[in-house]
């Protein structure tokens, strides 16, 4: 299995501690990513006064960006394992748009940015090496991406920077939940 | 100041039903990651239940599923612990929390604590 | 729900001893766990999280280590303080506790 980002030599064969299974392999992986956010966060949040905006919603109507709800059996109530597991890939296969969207927004944090793109690529293939149900994701249509990226790039200033934001905070919402559903699993 | 402060609690027969508030000052509960914990006399803490401030997803112990309702109202900075079909074992002093960060890894703000005994 | 089992649960040492608690967990919680100190009438007080991290604030006596399903607290040479009642508590799945290990005075 190869070794993904955030892990090292010492969680594969530290002293005095079991190895890492796949489940923690995988949350580590998120968190890894996470800890990305964070830090693409702050660069937006230095850089413009968009954390506090109370414009969001505005920004918001023209972006479809994956959420998790209820009918995707990925909270307790209602867990379905299967069903939440190809949300999950669905939604991080639906965000690697807006990922690619973020590779020129940054100027401190450009490899930051970077390695959450890919990262997010390694951990699609992991999650989808887990998934029985692979006939029920469905990958969004390569001209429709590039289409949403261009009219993403096109926008003013503004609206860029409100993007860029919302992007982070709803990726790092979706990580979020889907962290607590697969350690579910 | 950041606090929480805890509230409904009482004296309330086998069966019968509850509400517990819990109201933040200091910090928004939407977006922070909120959590009931319950001690009994004399005994240790037991975790009850927690949300998750994204989508509002809930998530509880084993012992309450099906019974207690964990819920929000951002606009009153408020979480609700709603109890129902209570039983003496029930009988602790529940208090809200707040986990600490965005990777909920320790209780960082702890409320006074609300009594609720279940006798008949 | 993850089964927290904490030992001992009563612990009686004396002041400048070096104690051990130990916690284990049900199934695996990675690094996602937590310990708190507790006296009476009052809220638990984090000493520790993510298995290992000291709280800033907390005396540099106070230790965690372990990651997967055995964790342990150690507390390097007892103070007065440090008569309490010591919780851990897992962050993975819901937050449940240990039983508690009550450290007494010999």
């Known amino acids: 299995a190869p070794v993904l980002p955030g892990e090292d030599s010492k969680d594969v064969a530290a002293p005095h501690s079991q190895p890492l299974t796949s489940s923690e392999r995988i949350d580590k992986h998120i968190r890894y990513i996470l800890d990305g956010i964070s830090a693409l966060r702050k660069e937006t949040c230095n850089r413009s006064n968009m954390c506090e905006s109370s414009k969001e919603a505005l920004a918001e109507n023209n972006l479809n960006l994956p959420k998790m709800a209820e009918k995707d059996g990925c909270f307790q109530s209602g867990f379905n394992e299967d069903t939440c597991l190809v949300k999950i890939i669905t939604g991080l296969l639906e965000f690697e748009v807006y990922l690619e969207y973020l590779q020129n927004r940054f100027e401190s944090s450009e490899e930051q940015a970077r390695a959450v793109q890919m990262s997010t690529k390694v951990l699609i293939q992991f999650l989808q090496k887990k998934a029985k149900n692979l006939d029920a994701i469905t990958t969004p249509e390569p001209t429709t991406n590039a289409s949403l990226l261009t009219k993403l790039q096109a926008q003013n200033q503004w609206l860029q920077d409100m993007t860029t934001h919302l992007i982070l905070r709803s990726f790092k919402e979706f990580l979020q939940s889907s962290l607590r559903a697969l350690r579910q699993m | 100041e950041v606090q929480l402060v805890e509230s409904g609690g009482g004296l309330v027969q086998p069966g019968g039903s509850l509400r517990l508030s819990c109201a933040a000052s200091?910090?928004?509960?939407?977006?922070?990651?909120m959590i009931w914990v319950r001690q009994a006399p004399g005994k240790g803490l037991e975790w009850v239940s927690d949300l998750y401030y994204y989508a509002g997803d809930t998530y509880y112990a084993d012992s309450v599923k099906g019974r207690f309702t964990m819920s929000r109202d951002i606009s009153k900075n408020t979480v609700y612990l709603q109890m129902n079909s209570l039983r003496a074992e029930d009988t602790a002093v529940y208090y809200c929390?707040?986990?600490?960060?965005?990777?909920?890894?320790?209780?960082?703000?702890w409320g006074r604590g609300t009594l609720v005994t279940v006798s008949s | 729900d993850i089964q927290m089992t904490q030992s001992p649960s009563t612990l009686s040492a004396s002041v400048g001893d070096r104690v051990t608690i130990t916690c284990r967990a049900s199934q695996g919680i990675s690094s996602w766990l937590a310990w708190y100190q507790q006296k009476p009438g009052k809220a638990p007080k984090v000493l520790i999280y993510k298995a290992s991290t000291l709280e800033s604030g907390v005396p540099s006596r106070f230790s965690g280590s372990g990651s997967g399903t055995e964790f342990t607290l150690t507390i390097s040479s007892l103070q007065p303080d440090d008569f309490a009642t010591y919780y851990c508590?897992?962050?993975?799945?819901?937050?449940?506790f240990g039983q508690g290990t009550k450290l007494e005075i010999k």
């Open positions: 200091g910090f928004t509960i939407s977006s922070n990651y």
């Open positions: 929390a707040r986990w600490a960060d965005d990777h909920p890894a320790w209780v960082d703000l």
């Open positions: 508590q897992q962050s993975w799945l819901g937050g449940s």
